[in-house]
Amino acid sequence: FGISGKHFITVTTFTSAGNIGEDGTLSCTFEPDIKLNGIVIQWLKEGIKGLVHEFKEGKDDLSQQHEMFRGRTAVFADQVVVGNASLRLKNVQLTDAGTYTCYIRTSKGKGNANLEYKTGAFSMPEINVDYNASSESLRCEAPRWFPQPTVAWASQVDQGANFSEVSNTSFELNSENVTMKVVSVLYNVTINNTYSCMIENDIAKATGDIKVTDSEVKRRSQLQLLNSGP
């Protein structure tokens, strides 16, 4: 297709990860242009003939869209004019992983940037006191992970201690036969201590903390995507 602008514009993408079975976002920004009708956004995927998505003249144009993305993509149309070319992706699949190109053309010029999109499954862990066990134990559960993660325990009091001998971790395949439920039990825990259950694969790292005292149980959990950024 013809290029209207002679200059190159800055296009920025962010490496991101998609959680299978959920909405995902392929992030891309560019130098804003108030002339919406002059903006063309094209998303391409390496190894795929046809487009992932195209937005031009103020609306979506799916005439060249590859079938695997039909009905699964949309730009944030009201944010295009301020330089947001990010793509919303419905029902992320493992096969959506790969290298994508965000190509932009405006009245100011043109530009493009690549991004690596990883797909897998990751979820927040929840730690509970396991009163069923013969000795006081902690049970760390996270419903959906893929690929299979590693699980490690740590404690505030015994920093640097190796808990692999006093913990037991299992992975149970979920009903869709891809993701797995992670369950890890830590035995012989002591009161007035903070324990952390850390779950990690090449996409995400999640940590669940629990503090058990005589009077209360405090919990906190966080999830961090790895290698996210420009």
């Epitope: 299978i20 079975g21 959920e22 909405d23 998505h53 609306k59 979506d60 144009d61 799916l62 005439s63 869209q65 039909r70 009905g71 699964r72 993509t73 949309a74 149309a77 919303r88 419905k90 029902n91 959906r144 979920n174 009903s175 869709e176 993701t179």
Partner: antibody
Framework: EVQLVQSGAEVKKPGASVKVSCKAS????????IGWVRQAPGQGLEWIGD????????NYNEKFKGRATITRDTSTSTAYLELSSLRSEDTAVYYC??????????????WGQGTLVTVSS | DIQMTQSPSSLSASVGDRVTITCKAS??????VAWYQQKPGKAPKLLIY???TLQPGVPSRFSGSGSGRDYTLTISSLQPEDFATYYC?????????FGQGTKVEIK
């Protein structure tokens, strides 16, 4: 305000065809999928299929493949459902509905008022 | 294609009751479950989409939850205008599918 206005009630004989229309207003017609759902008397909702007016792409419930045809006329912002080889079990209220999310096929967020199709000899 | 099995098919409740309706997907995992309310002679009304997102204008007594194959619609305190039939919808796959419906009646 999004509005979907459907054509009036129809009475058809078994074996005949019916074409129900759904005129959209209040949004960009070509940017959102439109779905069709039916409801037989006293029964639940049944998804028939949908269309993306911007390109004419369609999806159909296997049950209706070959008998249902979903089309659109972008010049009048109207979607159509044609059902052929009608039988008494096709007696139902037929609804059109806009799918949320523009080119992303979301849930049905705005509905037409429904069109009663009666199949009787 | 995915089927949605909804239960119960009907229930009787009083104003102020907490009501729970469930839908079980025949396979897979995705968060694309919506809930609709329908009153006699009217078109369905979208209450919740993407498992738990409340449609604008819908009262906060309605909530959705779920993961894996099991999804739930909860009405925390039933109001007189809530007596209706409720449907779940799976819209994550190419082929959409409704549950069979749950009629909520006055006890």
């Amino acid at each position: 305000e999004v509005q979907l206005v459907q054509s009036g009630a129809e009475v058809k004989k078994p074996g005949a065809s019916v074409k129900v229309s759904c005129k959209a207003s209040g949004y960009t017609f070509t940017s959102y999928w439109i779905g069709w759902v039916r409801q037989a008397p006293g029964q639940g909702l049944e998804w028939i299929g949908d269309i993306y007016p911007g390109g004419g792409y369609t999806n159909y419930n296997e049950k209706f493949k070959g008998r249902a045809t979903i089309t659109r006329d972008t010049s009048t912002s109207t979607a159509y459902l044609e059902l052929s080889s009608l039988r008494s079990e096709d007696t139902a209220v037929y609804y059109c509905a806009r799918l949320d999310g523009s080119s992303y096929r979301g849930a049905m967020d705005s509905w037409g008022q429904g069109t009663l199709v009666t199949v009787s000899s | 294609d995915i089927q949605m099995t909804q239960s119960p098919s009907s229930l009787s409740a009083s104003v102020g009751d907490r009501v729970t309706i469930t839908c079980k997907a025949s396979q897979g995992f995705n968060k694309y479950v919506a809930w609709y309310q329908q009153k006699p002679g009217k078109a369905p009304k979208l209450l919740i989409y993407y498992t738990s997102t409340l449609q604008p204008g819908v009262p906060s007594r309605f909530s959705g939850s779920g993961s894996g194959r099991d999804y739930t619609l909860t009405i925390s305190s039933l109001q007189p205008e809530d007596f209706a039939t409720y449907y779940c919808l799976q819209y994550g796959n190419l082929l959409y599918a409704f549950g069979q419906g749950t009629k909520v009646e006055i006890k």
